[in-house]
Amino acid sequence: MSSKYPRSVRRCLPLWALTLEAALILLFYFFTHYDASLEDQKGLVASYQVGQDLTVMAAIGLGFLTSSFRRHSWSSVAFNLFMLALGVQWAILLDGFLSQFPSGKVVITLFSIRLATMSALSVLISVDAVLGKVNLAQLVVMVLVEVTALGNLRMVISNIFNTDYHMNMMHIYVFAAYFGLSVAWCLPKPLPEGTEDKDQTATIPSLSAMLGALFLWMFWPSFNSALLRSPIERKNAVFNTYYAVAVSVVTAISGSSLAHPQGKISKTYVHSAVLAGGVAVGTSCHLIPSPWLAMVLGLVAGLISVGGAKYLPGCCNRVLGIPHSSIMGYNFSLLGLLGEIIYIVLLVLDTVGAGNGMIGFQVLLSIGELSLAIVIALMSGLLTGLLLNLKIWKAPHEAKYFDDQVFWKFPHLAVGF
């Protein structure tokens, strides 16, 4: 028999999503207005291009990157788009409320949209750990909680540690990774007998996942430079990110071959390791003074990524129930930490260069910032995981994990796949 959405979810999802959308529309109506001072139309177009790059990364890049499951590729791409669309709306409001609201209405600029898209990207990174095991109603909850947690984290870090937009957004890698892993830890883990084939990758979806990786690879320099405030910072960020991702591609492909007894290249390793350099240089991409340093970072990041992809999936599958192909979570957690360590090294150099005797204090502040990001990610992730386990969401039965047919109408299929 063809699998349908359970009746209760069929009632619950549209009601839940549309009520939320109506609430968002009302909030936009009462509390927002456009920036009226956009006088330079050419500048407007240039500014929009950055936002466009970020949207391509999110919708196509992360959408397709997570689509490698044999029987869950449709859901991966479309659910990602759904979460992005919802996440951006909520992030624009939340950022406005947190940063501008005391002065009256929230002013929406192209920068607001850029910032909101990056916040929503956090959810798309995290969700890789749980896609296939949750329905859309649950994903709505995840979007709301994660975007709220990230927005508040950024505000706290900005106020306490005096960091700019770029610096506090670059915690996104570590935050998203730990958030996703902690949500996954809360969800039912064992895959019942007979469904193991569903979380395997297939050739066509793997090709689309590679396409996603390529889009991310092409636009990662835009992501790392999007929130920087001066042309020189952006130029450095673009160059350094490009060098780092270029080297991590070479490292990923050769390292993957090296890691295999027969010297074969693993698609899964490559999907994620090609991005390794971009994640590792994220925090300090505008500060790295020369290309060779960015390239060395890309090399190290590629090796870490391939090593992690080889040895961590077993552990993650047992403990967190994350399938072998969903390696973004632990990949980003390791590489995000590497990026933060690089920044701490730069901070030490800065403090020494200034002849400042407060090295310990500065490093402690930076470690405090990172720890805060991890703690908030873990706590909000666990909270989300607990919420997602509530019966009201009518989560897919374990036997229906990684199954597009639970969610999609396939007219050409009477039964099964």
Epitope: D40, E233, F361
Partner: antibody, heavy 125, light 108 residues
Framework: QVQLVESGGGVVQPGTSLRLSCAAS????????MHWVRQAPGKGLEWVAY????????YYADSVKGRFTISRDNSKSTLNLQMNSLRAEDTAVYYC??????????????????WGQGTLVTVSS | DIQLTQSPSSLSASVGDRVTITCRAS??????LNWYQQKPGKAPKLLIS???SLQSGVPSRFSGSGSGTDFTLTISSLQREDYATYYC??????????FGQGTKLEIK
């Protein structure tokens, strides 16, 4: 050489509006962040507003938030400050200033390397 | 917001004197501090960036030092054209970019 020329100052009543402009020349305007800084008579310097080089992001001092709007037209190399709901305490000489960024190890240092001659705004009933 | 406190708020000195102005930040700002000079009726002029980097065209009698929370501007041998008001400004945090309240240097 770098030149910044402010205009639009004058005497206005409280609650009214005024628009200041700053015409830039001698450098590539579109590649620099720009600021407005003011100085009340006999007082120190107070930073007012800042706009990114591409106009995509803006910051304001708490004292002017919601009343002042900074904008720029890179095609005309002009910086503007729209001042609404003016108060007596907004009386000051308003300077536009160009921002320079230079790289440190762990963050960039920003400073104002060029200033205009200033334009006086007097808010009085 | 980071607060900057300059001392003294005014001082009198003679030509040839060595003058020191201090600026204290409410929290560590590493070396992200700039010094400006302003003469009456004129716009401010950048003297020193990054606590100790002298700008081109600024006489070498001006020097800056310090890091963390305590900074100093020193004029090794005061000249007549140095009588002005001096401001420190931090750019460690995101805007607002606070200035010190100023130090007025007068002829004795």
């Amino acid at each position: 050489q770098v030149q910044l020329v402010e205009s639009g100052g004058g005497v206005v009543q409280p609650g009214t509006s005024l628009r200041l402009s700053c015409a830039a020349s001698g450098f590539t305007f579109r590649t620099y962040g720009m600021h407005w800084v003011r100085q009340a008579p006999g007082k120190g310097l107070e930073w007012v507003a800042y706009i990114w080089y591409d106009g995509s992001n803006k910051y304001y001092a708490d004292s002017v938030k919601g009343r002042f709007t900074i904008s720029r037209d890179n095609s005309k190399s002009t910086l503007n400050l729209q001042m609404n709901s003016l108060r007596a305490e907004d009386t000051a000489v308003y300077y536009c200033a160009r921002e320079i960024a230079s790289r440190g190890y762990s963050r960039y240092l920003y400073y104002f390397d060029s200033w205009g001659q200033g334009t006086l705004v007097t808010v009085s009933s | 917001d980071i607060q900057l406190t300059q001392s003294p708020s005014s001082l009198s000195a003679s030509v040839g004197d060595r003058v020191t102005i201090t600026c204290r930040a409410s929290q560590s700002i590493s070396s992200y501090l700039n010094w400006y000079q302003q003469k009456p009726g004129k716009a401010p002029k950048l003297l020193i960036s990054a606590a100790s980097s002298l700008q081109s065209g600024v006489p070498s009698r001006f020097s800056g030092s310090g890091s963390g929370t305590d900074f100093t501007l020193t004029i090794s041998s005061l000249q007549r054209e140095d009588y002005a008001t001096y401001y420190c400004q931090q750019s460690y945090s995101t805007p607002p970019y606070t200035f010190g309240q100023g130090t007025k240097l007068e002829i004795k």
